[in-house]
């Protein structure tokens, strides 16, 4: 038997420095977690202790903090090289700055293979990108070889900016011939490494003949066997075992997100490359693991440019700004309220005595809120903090919608409530009541909106045939997170200001903020 240790990360999203437990900016260093310096310590410890070790990343290193805003991917290549990653799969966010923003900083600079079997370059891009990413790579590990085959969410063209000369094929369709090719090269230990989410990871394990292990990302899935060490609730055991169509037991793993954990999987293979056993658990990278001093020094050196860019205080918060997905994708969160209030404030235009303002309503997909802000840092809010909350560089736009469209949007907001999906809406100038005991599509039992044609603003029931102005992210105006009805039915769409700028301006104007959870979103008795 031959034993392989797979160390893996996914959805690190620009968390190069250690973070607080909720993956926002580190406040109290003694309680902080993750970061590449700490990750390196643990990886090196395992490399010294065990003979056959692979360090893999399943995509979405890009996008998430000021590190990416400023360094645009150069930081990813530099520190992944320093940690000596063995391979990486492309995630959807690797395309956020277009193909050029992937090629120049990362593909050309990475000293490790970057993989995706289901992305095909065509036209004039084919020669430009040739050899810079690969469908698979055969890696020597000890006396053996291991094949790593990559995959990327086929939704990427609708989630990011890959341009028109990359085609995203169905993952299973694309993976099978590459795995078959590896088999003909006498590679009998094959890992599928990719970024399509846990459901697709399990399907790959079930359907792709010859894949021995699946290491995934995209869905931020936390798997754990036993008592979990932090706040994350496991979606299943680690590894999650899938029985393939040809009767094999295939371990599937993922390691949550934000570099908080290092996935640790030990696989035992027989001489024919069959998996005999698999066990392990994600390792919580907490402060009991010291940060490697040389990597830490390098981080501090790279930090200087960020400090100049972003550390000026915009204003203060005297309350915790809850931007966690556990809150903002399930219920009213005060970070959502803050952002919506900023969006309305940014659109104050006193028109005449009949109207106090031309727009009173805001909607915001909870999935677009990517981080909380801890007030225990002297209350300081910086651009850097806001870049972690709103990392996607979108705009807050003005649209005109019929009441009936808004009703559909709010039904969509909770049509699959409870799965931590991004479409749950945060609001401003709206009071909504949901009854989750009713069937999807019929869960909005009350929807009141703030009047605009009034001298004293008050909440009135939404009228289906009336046309309303609403401020929302451009992502929603373009039908993102499944809000197709907004894109299809909007009557007018005007582009607005950069999202972080809107919020930073508001905070600077207010100087001290204390947003509350105040009953904008309610659940009727017995359903929540």
């Amino acid at each position: 038997a031959w034993e392989l240790t797979i160390l893996h990360t996914n959805d690190v999203h620009s968390r190069l420095e250690q973070t607080s437990e909720d993956s926002s900016k580190c406040v109290n260093a003694s309680r902080c977690m993750g970061g590449v310096a700490r990750l390196f310590t643990k990886v090196q410890q395992i490399r010294r202790a065990e003979p056959n070790v692979l360090l893999l990343d399943a995509g979405d290193q890009y996008q998430g903090t000021i590190w990416f805003t400023v360094y645009k991917g150069a930081e990813v290549a530099h520190f992944m090289n320093a940690l000596r990653y063995d391979a990486m799969a492309l995630g959807n966010h690797e395309f956020d700055n277009g193909v050029e923003g992937l090629i120049e900083p990362l593909l050309k600079e990475a000293k490790f293979p970057i993989l995706s079997a289901n992305i095909k370059a065509k036209g004039p891009l084919a020669s430009q990108i040739s050899g810079l990413y690969l469908p698979y790579k055969v890696l020597p590990v000890g006396d053996e070889v291991v094949g790593i085959v990559g995959y990327t969410s086929k939704e990427t063209p609708f989630l990011s900016n890959p341009g028109t000369n990359l085609v995203f094929e169905d993952e299973i369709t694309a993976l099978q011939p590459e795995v078959d090719k590896l088999k003909t090269l006498n590679v009998n230990k094959i890992i599928a490494l990719g970024h399509s989410g846990f459901e697709m990871d399990k399907l790959i394990a079930q359907k792709v003949r010859g894949v021995d292990v699946v290491v995934g990302g995209h869905s931020n899935t936390f798997l754990y066997t036993g008592n979990p060490p932090s706040k994350e609730v496991p979606a299943g055991k680690y590894p999650f075992i899938v029985t393939s169509d040809d009767g094999r037991k295939v371990p599937v793993v993922q390691a949550y997100a934000f570099g908080k954990y290092l996935g640790y999987l030990k696989i035992e293979f027989d001489e024919r490359g069959n998996v005999i056993s698999s066990h392990g658990n994600p390792i919580l990278l907490n402060s009991s693991i010291p940060e490697d001093p040389s990597i830490k020094a390098d981080i501090n050196k790279w930090r200087i440019k960020l400090d100049n860019y972003s550390t000026q205080e915009l204003g203060k918060t005297i309350v915790y700004l809850d931007g966690s997905s556990q809150s903002c994708r399930f219920r009213e969160c005060n970070m959502g309220n803050l952002i919506c209030d900023a969006m309305i404030n940014n659109n104050l235009r006193h028109t005449d005595e009949m109207f106090w303002n031309h727009v009173s309503m805001c909607i915001l997909n909870g999935g677009g809120i990517r981080s909380p802000i801890d007030e225990r840092n002297n209350g300081t809010i910086t651009w850097e903090n806001l870049a972690a909350v709103l990392p996607f560089g979108g705009t807050f736009d003005l649209v005109q919608l019929k009441g009936s469209t808004l009703k559909k949007a709010f039904e969509h907001s909770v049509h699959r409530y409870g799965q931590s999906t991004g479409e749950f809406l945060q609001v401003g100038g709206i009071h909504v009541v949901y009854d989750l005991s009713r069937k999807p599509g019929d869960r909005v039992v009350k929807l009141d909106v703030l009047c605009t044609k009034c001298r004293v603003p008050s909440y009135d029931p939404l009228k289906m045939d009336e046309v309303y102005k609403v401020i929302l992210p451009n992502f929603l105006a373009n039908g993102g997170d499944g809000f197709q009805m907004i894109k299809d039915e909007l009557l007018r769409h005007d582009s607005g200001d950069q999202d972080i700028n809107v919020v930073s301006t508001y905070i600077s104007k207010m100087k001290v903020i204390y947003p509350a959870v105040e009953g904008r979103i309610k659940f009727s008795t017995g359903s929540h």
Partner: antibody
């Protein structure tokens, strides 16, 4: 001037295979993806698949996997499509079409090759 | 897979008239839609791509519009050479490039 010159009409027996050629001229052959399209009874257009001459990458419509195989000969700037195990359902006009510079639409088409499968 | 539905399947119009052909996608395809014209016994020819960009040499009486799932091709002041079949096609993101079923435009 961009031109795509396809091979002539073919009459073949059921069960046979055949190869259609598409010779490109007037542009850099390796810089553009070549697509193949089927048109039955002068009506529906169906995308079969494409090949990127630079790297030989192919993608097929699932419906035509196992039926069509596309290849290129870079030295002669020619694209080929092999059609296998022919039946009367395969009787159609087949077009090669160059993909536009920024992807997916077809800016130049061959004149078409008519295939008749009949015993 | 994305399906493209064209309407009407056929229409007849007179020279000088304005006609509109519509194309519906089964899901959001943003602005990645092309239109082709095909005359009897000839190859299709690209008219419009990215919903509204006219291909080289295409007269300005042709115009495309729409986004998301609903698209249309408008031909102002029909000319005798405009009669034939028109096809829409989705051209991005997915390896499938589906065509609509076609619209036959005949002289009244």
């Amino acid at each position: 001037e961009v031109q795509l010159q396809q091979s002539g009409p073919e009459l073949v027996k059921p069960g046979a295979s055949m190869k259609i050629s598409c010779k490109a001229s007037g542009y850099s052959f390796t810089g553009y993806t070549m697509n193949w399209v089927k048109q039955s009874h002068g009506k529906n257009l169906e995308w079969i698949g494409f090949i990127t001459p630079y790297n030989g990458d192919t993608i097929y419509n699932q419906k035509f996997k196992g039926k069509a195989t596309v290849t290129v000969d870079k030295s002669s700037s020619t694209a080929y499509m092999d059609l296998l195990s022919l039946t009367s359902e395969d009787s159609a006009v087949y077009y090669c079409a160059r993909e536009g510079y920024d992807g997916g639409y077809f800016d130049y088409w061959g004149q078409g090759t008519t295939l008749t499968v009949s015993s | 897979d994305i399906q493209m539905t064209q309407s009407p399947a056929s229409l007849s119009a007179s020279v000088g008239e304005t006609v509109t052909i519509t194309c519906r996608a089964s899901e959001n395809i943003y602005s990645y839609l092309a239109w082709y014209q095909q005359k009897q016994g000839k190859s299709p020819q690209l008219l419009v791509y990215n919903t509204q960009t006219l291909a080289e040499g295409v007269p300005s009486r042709f115009s495309g519009s729409g986004s998301g799932t609903q698209f249309s091709l408008k031909i102002n002041s029909l000319q005798p050479e405009d009669f034939g079949s028109y096809y829409c096609q989705h051209h991005y993101g997915t390896p499938m490039y589906p065509f609509g079923g076609g619209t036959k435009l005949e002289i009244k």
